[in-house]
């Protein structure tokens, strides 16, 4: 049985999220990729997605999300910008393969966000937020929407124990409300 | 439990080769990226080289770039780190070490093995 | 390639007392930062990454702080298994992943 295990960060509000979610290259590269979020008891929810087929190295900003595939290193890099306490829960990034299901990327990723100064005394803030200043993606097409008798109907566990799954293609039931929000000018 | 365990240090001329091994346990070996770090004596760390798991994707400091080549058997759970052309100053302890599935923080290290290049 | 300065070279704390490590990036690295601790013989330890995430297991007496280019880890009460080297690492962007020189923290 694989494992689905989580990684946890803990960060304060106002700091940045900055992911890589590894793939493999012959298979994924030009493969649609998402970001979504799993509240408890709740299907997974996709935040943001790269185009249809992903576009090398080009970003793809959704409100504070943004998304790059670098398709020569085989990695899709998630950021959260301007985090929130509300932004706290659990992420992964999956990779959609149609007509098959959504296949996860390891692992998955704990977000702990706090209130409270994220930085110390002299630290250099503003050059954090300076290299995201990065002009929005308008792309007309939606994340997918799948629906599948194998439906995940429980999201896992808060602990971080290791949660046994059948296989590694998780059945994941996305949703559609995605809005592309310009957070920089 | 996790566990890494370096092997195929020893002495060699400069100019010689060494194939290092790690072999691993405890963890999904295919799933996870791997590094090799190396530490000369009474010296801090310093990266050497790194493969990513499901690319495969590798990396190499400029110090070693063309000399040494990472890779992985994920059938036999082993990494390896092949050196070449070695010099005075690769002499150091080499860690294997596993990183993070999200970024290239180091979380298990195995106990190092000796190179030492002396003529 | 990003240069990883530690502050200082060595410090002497007495047991008990508060010790603060310093850390600066020639560039920022967003909180792209681990800690780590090497005991003499040993193979070094992660101890904080994420900038201010402790590692499974470690003491609460542990802390980290920072963003951009300035971080600090600060041990609250050095405790005698606390006596190491203590490193700093980047990870952000693409290789090469880049660590400090090392603060000894040693027995005042």
């Known amino acids: 049985a694989t494992k689905l295990t989580e990684e946890k960060y803990e960060l304060k509000e106002g700091q940045t999220l900055d992911v890589k979610c590894d793939y493999t290259l012959e298979k994924f590269a030009s493969s649609q990729k998402a970001w979504q979020i799993i509240r408890d008891g709740e299907m997974p929810k996709t935040l943001a997605c790269t185009e249809r087929p992903s576009k090398n190295s080009h970003p793809v900003q959704v409100g504070r999300i943004i998304l790059e595939d670098y398709h020569d290193h085989g990695l899709l890099r998630v950021r959260m910008v301007n985090l929130q306490v509300e932004d706290s829960g659990l992420y992964q990034c999956v990779i959609y393969q149609p007509p098959k299901e959504p296949h996860m990327l390891f692992d998955r990723i704990r977000l702990v966000v706090t209130k409270g100064f994220s930085g110390t005394p002299g630290s250099n803030e503003n050059s954090t937020q300076n290299v995201y200043k990065i002009p929005p993606t308008t792309t007309k097409a939606l994340c997918p929407l799948y629906t599948s008798p194998r439906t995940v109907t429980q999201a896992p566990p808060k602990s971080t124990a290791d949660v046994s799954t059948p296989d590694s293609e998780i059945n994941l039931t996305n949703v559609t409300d995605i809005i592309r929000v310009p957070v920089f000018n | 439990e996790v566990q890494l365990l370096e092997s195929g240090g020893g002495m060699v001329q400069p100019g010689g080769s060494l194939r290092l091994s790690c072999a691993v346990s405890g963890f999904t070996f295919s799933r996870y990226a791997m590094s090799w770090v190396r530490q000369a004596p009474g010296k801090g760390l310093e990266w050497v080289s790194e493969?990513?798991?499901?690319?495969?994707?590798?990396y190499y400091a400029d110090s070693v770039k063309g000399r040494f080549t990472i890779s992985r058997d994920n059938s036999k759970n082993t990494l390896y780190l092949q050196m070449n052309s070695l010099r005075v100053e690769d002499t150091a302890i080499y860690y294997c070490a596993k990183e993070f599935s999200s970024n290239s923080l180091f979380d298990y290290w195995g106990q190092g093995t000796l190179v030492t290049v002396s003529s | 390639e990003i240069v990883m300065t530690q502050s200082p070279a060595t410090l002497s704390v007495s047991p008990g007392e508060r010790a603060t490590l310093s850390c600066r990036a020639s560039q920022s690295v967003n909180v792209n930062l681990a800690w780590y601790q090497q005991k003499p013989g040993q193979a070094p330890r992660l101890l904080i990454y994420g900038a201010s995430t402790r590692a499974t297991g470690i003491p609460a007496r542990f802390s980290g702080s920072g963003s951009g280019t300035e971080f600090t880890l600060t041990i609250s009460s050095l405790q005698s298994e606390d006596f190491a080297v203590y490193y700093c690492q980047q990870f952000y962007n693409w290789p090469p992943w880049t660590f400090g020189q090392g603060t000894k923290v040693e027995i005042k």
């Open positions: 493969m990513r798991g499901s690319s495969g994707s590798t």
